[in-house]
């Protein structure tokens, strides 16, 4: 669709700003109906109120929007555009309001934003473009630091035939928009893997957040351009054992945070080096909390106790001498 | 039974203004959004406004825009639309139409229509 | 603006014969999640009534004699057995954004 002329100054990915406009306009700065505004916050609250739509005329003052609770299903390019623009809006909380659909430059016209909280949504469609509104190979930088996506993957039956953490990663890599972030929250989404390409395409993240999840390993993923990680959660998730390479990567970011809690640990050979790093390392929260999951004899030794005598590997027998 | 009755309709000189209602019974107004699609003699469909349930959304044709002006009174489960500064291509029937949402719905129930005839 | 034609504008068909009419969007009005296509009968005299939504859903009370397929640009609305009530105007429908607009509209005619 094309711009119209009143609204020549937006890109055409917007259509719903031209026609987001009342014919009569509203008081400069009144509050929509089912919402609460208060200027002084700078707050507008439109919450638990099934809204199928982003109400038209939010007042010019909001830095603060919390939609959640509604029923909004699809956010369309341009969902937020307003003329004149949202120039101040930084907070946008959209969490539990039924979306299953970002559309393309869903996020437009918005160049104040700093936080996005999509959680708690069924994301069956999330565009590649959602975040950096182009299909350019380069976008134009967004103003996002804080995006926070806990809890978006649909029910199995809702899934499209394709992977969630690749649709996921499409979004946040897109254009190399996201280059300032500093927080991403991803927790709760059954993530099996991690692109390796993601977090080094993240560089300025602070903050990353995996935890409940069904990550196995972490082999593939990098970790060694994110200088300023200060938090990694890993919490609830499937890992079994730490190798090498990541404990060198995470030993060498110089103000990390590590949390394993609750994931279930192998305790045979190839941990040896996991336990060694973690009698010695300062960066992992709650080490001595970490035990074993397997094998059986060793369920809930913790893994800060166990010397290599206890971590054996049982030897691989020739076909001939193993048993059905 | 869903209901929707147009009514306001009738002849109006160019420059003029004329206000449409159309009253719902049937089911619950305010659960539902609503819009305005007219018919020129002869023609096809044409959408005119959009509201939403709670009057927190509103979207116009670019041909009506800063001229027709949608609202709607939940408490009387009635529907407006105001037009000033009537053309006479907006000489058309106008017909009140339900929605469950806007992008996801649909015009699942239709009134019978009103005529607006704008002629000098 | 999206654009819907359809084909053909007119049709005139025997009762008890198939009838197809086709809706070409100008874009693409789907996405993985939903199919924002729609398709309406106005019978002589009388406002529009939806037959079927989202391309392929018939809505409740329409004969299953017609039946909505397609997605992204190209959809189809068919009739397996013409019958006379069902004359008058076809027109599809998108809702991907704003404005909503129209197709032409196919007059189906009985021979």
């Known amino acids: 669709s094309s711009p119209t002329s009143s609204a020549s100054s937006f890109s055409s990915s917007a259509p719903f700003l031209a026609s987001a406009v009342s014919a009569q306009p509203p008081l400069p700065d009144q509050c929509p109906a089912l919402c609460e505004c208060s200027e002084a916050a700078r707050t507008v609250k439109c919450v638990n109120r099934n809204l199928t739509e982003v109400p038209t005329d939010l007042p010019a003052y909001v830095r603060n929007l919390f939609l959640t609770g509604n029923q909004l299903a699809v956010l369309p390019a341009g969902a937020f555009a307003r003329r004149p623009p949202l120039a101040e809006l930084a907070a946008l909380n959209l969490s539990g309001s039924r979306l299953d659909e970002v559309r393309a430059g869903a996020f437009e016209h918005l160049p104040s934003l700093r936080q996005l909280d999509l959680s708690h949504n069924p994301l069956a469609d999330l565009s590649p473009f959602a975040f950096s509104g182009s299909n350019a190979s380069v976008s134009a930088p967004s103003p996002l630091v804080e995006l926070i996506l806990n809890h978006i993957v649909p029910p199995e039956d809702e899934r499209q035939n394709r992977s969630f953490e690749g649709m996921v990663v499409a979004a946040l890599l897109a254009g190399r928009a996201l280059q300032g972030l500093r927080r991403l929250e991803l927790a709760s989404n059954h993530f099996l893997y991690l692109p390796r390409d993601v977090l080094a395409q993240l560089p300025s993240l602070r903050h990353l957040d995996l935890s409940n999840n069904s990550l196995v390993s972490l082999t593939y993923v990098s970790f060694r351009n994110l200088t300023h990680l200060e938090s990694l959660h890993l919490e609830d998730n499937a890992l079994k054992v730490l190798h090498n390479g990541t404990l060198a990567e995470l030993q060498g970011l110089p103000h990390i945070r590590v949390f394993l809690d609750n994931n279930p640990w192998v305790c045979d050979c190839h941990m040896a080096d996991m336990v060694t790093w973690l009698k010695e390392t300062e960066v992992v929260q709650g080490k001595d909390r970490l035990t074993c999951a397997y094998p059986e004899k060793m369920r809930n030794r913790v893994l800060l106790e166990l010397n290599s005598a206890d971590l054996d590997c049982d030897p691989i027998l020739p076909p001939s001498l193993q048993t059905s | 039974e869903v209901q929707l009755v147009e009514s306001g309709g009738g002849v109006v000189q160019p420059g003029r203004s004329l206000r449409l209602s159309c009253a719902a019974s049937g089911f619950t107004f305010s659960n539902f959004g609503m819009h305005w699609v007219r018919q020129a003699p002869g023609k096809g469909l044409e959408w005119v406004a959009y509201i939403s349930s709670g009057s927190t959304s509103f979207y116009y044709a670019d041909t009506v825009k800063g001229r027709f002006t949608i609202s709607r009174d939940n408490s009387k489960n009635t529907l407006y639309l105001q037009m000033n500064s009537l053309r006479a291509e907006d000489t058309a029937v106008y017909y009140c139409?339900?929605?469950?949402?806007?992008?996801?719905?649909?015009?699942?129930?239709w009134g019978q229509g009103t005529t607006v005839t704008v002629s000098s | 603006d999206i654009v819907l034609t359809q084909t053909p504008l007119s049709l005139s068909v025997t009762p008890g014969q198939p009838a197809s009419i086709s809706c070409r969007a100008s874009q693409s009005v789907s996405s993985s999640s939903y199919t924002y296509l729609h398709w309406y009968l106005q019978k002589p005299g009388q406002p529009p009534q939806l037959l079927i939504k989202?391309?392929?859903n018939l809505e409740s009370g329409v004969p299953d004699r017609f039946s909505g397929s397609g997605s992204g640009t190209d959809f189809t609305l068919k009739i397996s057995r013409v019958e006379a009530e069902d004359v008058g105007v076809y027109y599809c429908?998108?809702?991907?954004?704003?404005?909503?607009?129209f197709g032409q509209g196919t007059k189906l005619e009985i021979k």
């Open positions: 139409s339900r929605t469950n949402s806007l992008l996801r719905g649909f015009f699942d129930a």
């Open positions: 429908q998108h809702s991907w954004e704003i404005p909503l607009t």
């Open positions: 989202s391309a392929s």
